[in-house]
């Protein structure tokens, strides 16, 4: 908190300019009018103030706008944004994508800070949903943004926004998140032809059910092992050896290297050894020949 002192004669700021960097903190407090600062916020970013001086400028804005800054000021905060707390940001009503971009630019190259997370949350809540332009912007600055959202939050993503998602945006998503995103992606890409469809849907397949994987196996998609390993175990288990062979195409040979890892390990345990042998990969652990397989889940469903 800066003490209230009278502004020395001749030092009253007529505009926000570089001469202010020579002011002591108390002089900034006494000589810079908060309303002048608010109307010339765009200039602050072009002046190399110290962190201590920025604290004073923030304090002046806080006094002028105790209920939260107007968007006209927020858009030009620049590096002053780094001084804001999540509590400050919760008072804001940010509706313009340009404002969001301007503030994300300030934080560019850094981890997502609590301030940025709060800003994004306020922005998205204000819009009511994650539209394509917003998603485009957020994933450009933070590729992992989508995977930081809860399944509930992801449910507000309209299918049209899925077009903005790049494979790397889904790298850190867990199965619960992909369960929500996959149906949206399926809807978004439904009018594409086979090979183009697979290229687009591939990143989302960690949320695909068995029937969709069976359908894909009929389309010569040649799924790579990395994608296969991210599939839901419960979706892979019912696939036959023939279906997996068709699904993977030439990549089927990679199963040998992954035979001890999920979902391959669990899938092998469900297959007849005879069927696994037809692959010629030396996969072991299948059901020995002559054994009867009881599908207990089916039995439970019938009882």
């Amino acid at each position: 908190e800066v003490e209230k002192t009278a502004c020395p004669s001749g030092k009253k700021a007529r505009e926000i300019d570089e001469s202010l960097i020579f002011y002591k903190k108390w002089e900034l407090e006494a000589c810079v009018d908060a309303a002048l600062l608010a109307t010339q916020m765009d200039r602050v970013n072009a002046i190399p103030f110290t962190y201590e001086q920025l604290d004073v400028l923030k304090h002046k804005l806080d006094e002028l706008y105790p209920q939260g800054y107007p968007e006209s000021v927020i858009q030009h905060l620049g590096y002053l944004f780094l001084k804001m707390s999540p509590e400050d940001i919760r008072k804001w009503n940010v509706t313009s994508l340009e404002t969001l971009k301007a503030l994300l630019e300030v934080n560019k190259g850094h981890e997502m800070s609590p301030q940025v997370a709060t800003l994004i949350d306020r922005f998205v809540k204000g819009r009511g949903q994650l539209d394509k332009d917003t998603l485009d912007t957020l994933t450009a600055f933070y590729p992992g943004y989508l995977c930081s959202l809860s399944p509930e939050e992801l449910s507000s993503v309209p299918p049209s926004s899925i077009w903005a998602v790049r494979p790397q945006d889904l790298d850190t998503c867990d199965p619960r998140q992909l369960d929500v995103l996959y149906p949206k992606a399926r809807l978004a890409f439904q009018n594409m032809n086979g090979s183009e469809y697979f290229v687009k849907i591939q990143s989302f397949l960690g949320g695909a059910p068995t029937e969709d994987l069976k359908a894909l196996s009929q389309q010569n998609v040649s799924m790579d092992l990395a994608t296969f390993m991210k599939l839901r175990t419960d979706a892979v288990l019912p696939l036959t050896v023939a279906e997996v062979q068709k699904l993977l195409g030439p990549h089927v040979e990679g199963l040998k290297a992954e035979e001890r890892h999920r979902p391959v390990r669990d899938w092998i345990l469900r297959q007849r050894q005879d069927d696994l042998d037809t692959l010629g990969l030396g996969l072991q652990g299948g059901i020995p020949n002559g054994y009867l397989v009881l599908d207990l889940s089916m039995q439970e469903a019938l009882s």
Partner: nanobody
């Protein structure tokens, strides 16, 4: 992306030093640069300023006529020529480019 200050040292009163502020990872052409200093136990204060084009310069009253700020965009460096140094100029000197100083600074001791 950072600014690196150099050129500080121990100098006798009345002596001179030239400080350099070099940019690493980005070009300084588009940025206004400020030199600041902070003496032990004192508030950090602005010393000098130069606009991105170099056409506009400004100085704190305490250094006017003794310090000169200049820039060489080809070398990606801004300089602070300090003449007629006084004991009260003793401080850590920092440079900043359109955002608060982030460098380690360079120590100038006048004694």
């Amino acid at each position: 992306l950072q600014l690196v200050e150099s050129g500080g040292g121990l100098v006798q009163p009345g002596g001179s030093l030239r400080l350099s502020c070099a940019a690493s990872g980005f070009t300084l052409d588009y940025f206004a640069i400020g030199w600041f200093r902070q003496a032990p136990g004192k508030e950090r204060e602005g010393v000098s300023y130069i606009s991105s084009s170099g056409g506009s310069t400004n100085y704190a009253d305490s250094v006017k006529g003794r310090f000169t700020i200049s820039r060489d965009n080809a070398k990606n460096t801004v300089y602070l020529q300090m003449n007629s140094l006084k004991p009260e100029d003793t401080a850590v000197y920092y440079c900043a480019a359109d955002w608060p100083p982030g460098g380690q600074g360079t120590l100038v001791t006048v004694s």
